[in-house]
């Protein structure tokens, strides 16, 4: 007898994991055998779709590999033409083990700023997210919070927040761990110990001390009166993210010394500065009788001529004595290019010692003139011919007025080493005695006006003169 369809096994809710099998059963009793159709969210399932399997005349519908998108309401409808069609529905809930879709990444952050480590997850049931720092679960506090999204937010990042982090996503089906990431906390450069100001006597040695910290460890540079320090020695050491820099100075003039600590944060730099003043006891601005100060020679032209670290007199009648006197020497040396090979080294020695006179430090720095004997040795022995030309140019006013120092020294006005050996400066480069000089042919027709002294011997001779050179 014909019998209208009756669903004997109504559909139930099916839970399935992604990639698993899910089966709905819709057992039907009827005669004749019914046509069974299936829908998902009221859309007909095509039975030739290879993602599905149909068994037992449509009474079993199997999804062979569940996807996220399969979630929904499934209904089976049975109809055999006898009575009305019957329907039963059930839900497919696609369950999913936790999956971290946006894992955290390594972060570099400056102390005091806000850091956010992402951890976006998927899963059904919705996973709960927690974080591990190092090997221990991370505790939330007023600064540290796990957001609804799973991301970790750290307000006012501190140095101690640095370390290795990973997020953990958990639901009833399993647990997923992110890879371990590094939170690096960078700290602006900061000076821990500033250099101290000193009031010292002229010619003292002073050590300025500057200590700085930061992450990364900063570098320290020293500035003297606005320029990079050119003299003095710097010693540095680094320990536990602290850099210690010591600048040792030989004090010949007052100055402002600045310690600058710098470190880099990405493309930007942070700096910290601290300054110290060096003043010289009883130092005052040059008076009428105090026309300059002593300082180490820092130029280039006279480097080979003047003794290393020589204290020279800098004339404060110039705005910038060092630069002005260097320019004078430079200009004069260019004039010397045309003189004879015998004259030139002697003239250079005389010129450098005349323009950059040796300096006697003290309450009133005093220039020490060249000894007359050395001046005469250059004038009448080595450079007789050239000297005449230079004197003539000076008298005819061929040198500009500001070049008055270029006027060759008047040897007769210079102190003699016989009067007071400490009152004048010697030219160590002229290491010739009378015996050497006698081998030279006569330099002029006139007799030297004074007896050429025995010049002191020096091991640092910067030139030698062969007797075969002609002076004419």
């Amino acid at each position: 007898l014909p019998k209208a369809p009756v669903i004997t096994t109504p559909l139930e809710t099916v839970d399935a994991l992604v990639e698993e099998v899910a089966t709905f059963m819709c057992a039907v009793e009827s005669y004749p055998q019914p046509e069974i159709s299936w829908t998902r969210n009221k859309i007909l399932i095509k039975l030739f779709d290879t993602r599905y399997s149909i068994r037992e005349n449509g009474q079993l519908l199997t999804i062979l590999s569940v996807e996220d998108s399969d979630d929904g309401i499934y209904c089976c409808t049975a109809n055999n033409g006898v009575g009305g069609a019957v329907e039963s529905c059930g839900a497919l809930q696609v369950k999913m083990k936790p999956k971290i879709t946006r894992p955290p990444i390594n972060v570099k952050i400056i102390e005091g700023l806000k850091a956010v480590l992402p951890c976006t997850t998927m899963g059904n049931p919705k996973p709960s997210v927690s974080w591990i720092k190092g090997d221990s679960p991370l505790r939330e506090n007023s600064r540290i919070a796990v957001l609804e999204s799973g991301s970790l937010r750290i307000h006012n990042v501190q140095k101690e927040d640095a370390g290795q982090y990973r997020c953990v996503a958990k639901n009833s089906l399993g647990t997923a761990y992110s890879k371990v990431v590094k939170l690096e906390v960078e700290v602006f450069a900061r000076i821990l110990r500033a250099p101290e100001s000193h009031n010292v006597t002229f010619g003292s040695f002073v050590t300025l001390h500057c200590t700085a910290t930061g992450i990364p460890v900063p570098t320290i540079t020293w500035i003297e009166n606005g320029n990079a320090v050119s003299s003095g020695s710097i010693q540095e050491s680094v320990k536990d993210r602290v850099i210690d820099s010591r600048l040792q100075l030989f004090i010949t003039k007052p100055g402002l010394y600045t310690c600058i600590a710098t470190n880099k944060h990405g493309e930007k730099f942070s700096t910290a500065k601290a300054a110290a003043t060096i003043s010289i006891a009883e130092w005052s601005k040059p008076q009428k009788d105090n026309k300059g100060y002593c300082a180490q020679y820092r130029g280039e032209v006279c480097n080979a001529v003047l003794a290393k670290d020589a204290l020279v007199f800098l004339n404060t009648s110039y705005a910038d004595p060092e630069e002005a006197q260097e320019l004078l020497v430079h200009t004069a040396w260019n004039e010397l290019k045309v003189v004879s090979p015998v004259c030139r080294p002697a003239a250079e020695a005389l010129l450098c010692n005349h323009i950059f006179q040796e300096c006697s430090p003290g309450v009133v720095p005093t220039p020490i003139p060249i000894c007359r004997e050395y001046c005469l040795a250059v004038k009448e022995l080595f450079c007789a011919k050239e000297w005449l030309v230079m004197e003539e140019k000076t008298h005819r006013g061929l040198y500009r007025s500001e070049m008055h120092l270029l006027s060759v020294p008047e040897c007769s006005k210079l102190p003699s080493m016989h009067w007071d050996p400490t009152a004048c400066a010697r030219l160590p480069h002229l290491d010739y005695n009378k015996e050497n000089l006698k081998t030279f042919p006569p330099m002029t027709s006139s007799k030297p006006s004074v007896d050429i002294p025995n010049l002191p011997s020096s091991s640092s001779s910067s030139f030698s003169v062969s007797p075969t050179y002609s002076m004419t």
């Epitope: 099998v21 399997s53 149909i54 037992e56 009474q59 062979l64």
Partner: antibody
Framework: EVQLVESGGGLVKPGGSLRLSCAAS????????MAWVRQAPGKGLEWVSS????????YYADSLKGRFTISRDNAKNSLYLQMNSLRAEDTAVYYC??????????????WGQGTLVTVSS | DIQMTQSPSSLSASVGDRVTITCRAS??????VNWYQQKPGKAPKLLIY???TLQSGVPSRFSGSGSGTDFTLTISSLQPEDFATYYC?????????FGQGTKLEIK
């Protein structure tokens, strides 16, 4: 009474072919899904293949796909298994079974006595 | 494929003992599990279907339970004719799979 009788087993060389048959009686064959299940000597049961009553739905065990073919002739109430490229590991007793929709899922409620297939050189 | 893992693989027991065999599925399969008994040289016989329903003609000492992934076959009081090999089978997927079997022997 449901009856299933297998035939066609025997000795075959590796690489050879064999066709098994199953004669069914005592039930509406054309309305029933039929299956082959095998059992290697001293081993467990292994489902091989199933075919729906109208032959529209056919399934094979993944490991056998491409070498075995299930078919049926409802007019003759017969089920067949064509086995090609036979290997030593195909040596087993092959059972013909009727699949039946149960309260949940399907089960094999009737079995034949089995036919032995030996693949050996 | 859905794997069915049966334990133990063999079991020695005496007549009158209560025996339990378990079967675990590799994914949730609702109650789509059947149990079979096979004696040496014979074809398997359906004992229990839909995880817990006794096939007609099967003695009531046999019972089945479980849902999801874990299933159990229990023989409340072993009889001499119960010494055989038992198999679980899933039909949740159309690619049917059996457990590897549990051989029940007389102690």
């Amino acid at each position: 009474e449901v009856q299933l009788v297998e035939s066609g087993g025997g000795l075959v060389k590796p690489g050879g072919s064999l066709r098994l048959s199953c004669a069914a009686s005592g039930f509406t064959f054309s309305a029933s899904t039929m299956a082959w299940v095998r059992q290697a000597p001293g081993k467990g049961l292994e489902w091989v293949s199933s075919v729906s009553g109208d032959s529209h739905h056919i399934y094979y065990a993944d490991s056998l796909k491409g070498r075995f073919t299930i078919s049926r002739d409802n007019a003759k109430n017969s089920l067949y298994l064509q086995m090609n490229s036979l290997r030593a590991e195909d040596t087993a007793v092959y059972y013909c079974a009727r699949e039946r929709l149960l309260r949940l899922g399907v089960g094999f409620d009737s079995w034949g006595q089995g036919t032995l297939v030996t693949v050996s050189s | 494929d859905i794997q069915m893992t049966q334990s133990p693989s063999s079991l020695s027991a005496s007549v009158g003992d209560r025996v339990t065999i378990t079967c675990r599925a590799s994914q949730r399969i609702s109650g789509f599990v059947n149990w079979y008994q096979q004696k040496p040289g014979k074809a398997p016989k359906l004992l229990i279907y839909a995880a817990s329903t006794l096939q007609s003609g099967v003695p009531s000492r046999f019972s089945g339970s479980g849902s999801g992934t874990d299933f159990t076959l229990t023989i409340s009081s072993l009889q001499p004719e119960d010494f055989a090999t038992y198999y679980c089978q899933q039909s949740y997927s159309p690619l049917y799979t059996f457990g590897q079997g549990t051989k029940l022997e007389i102690k």
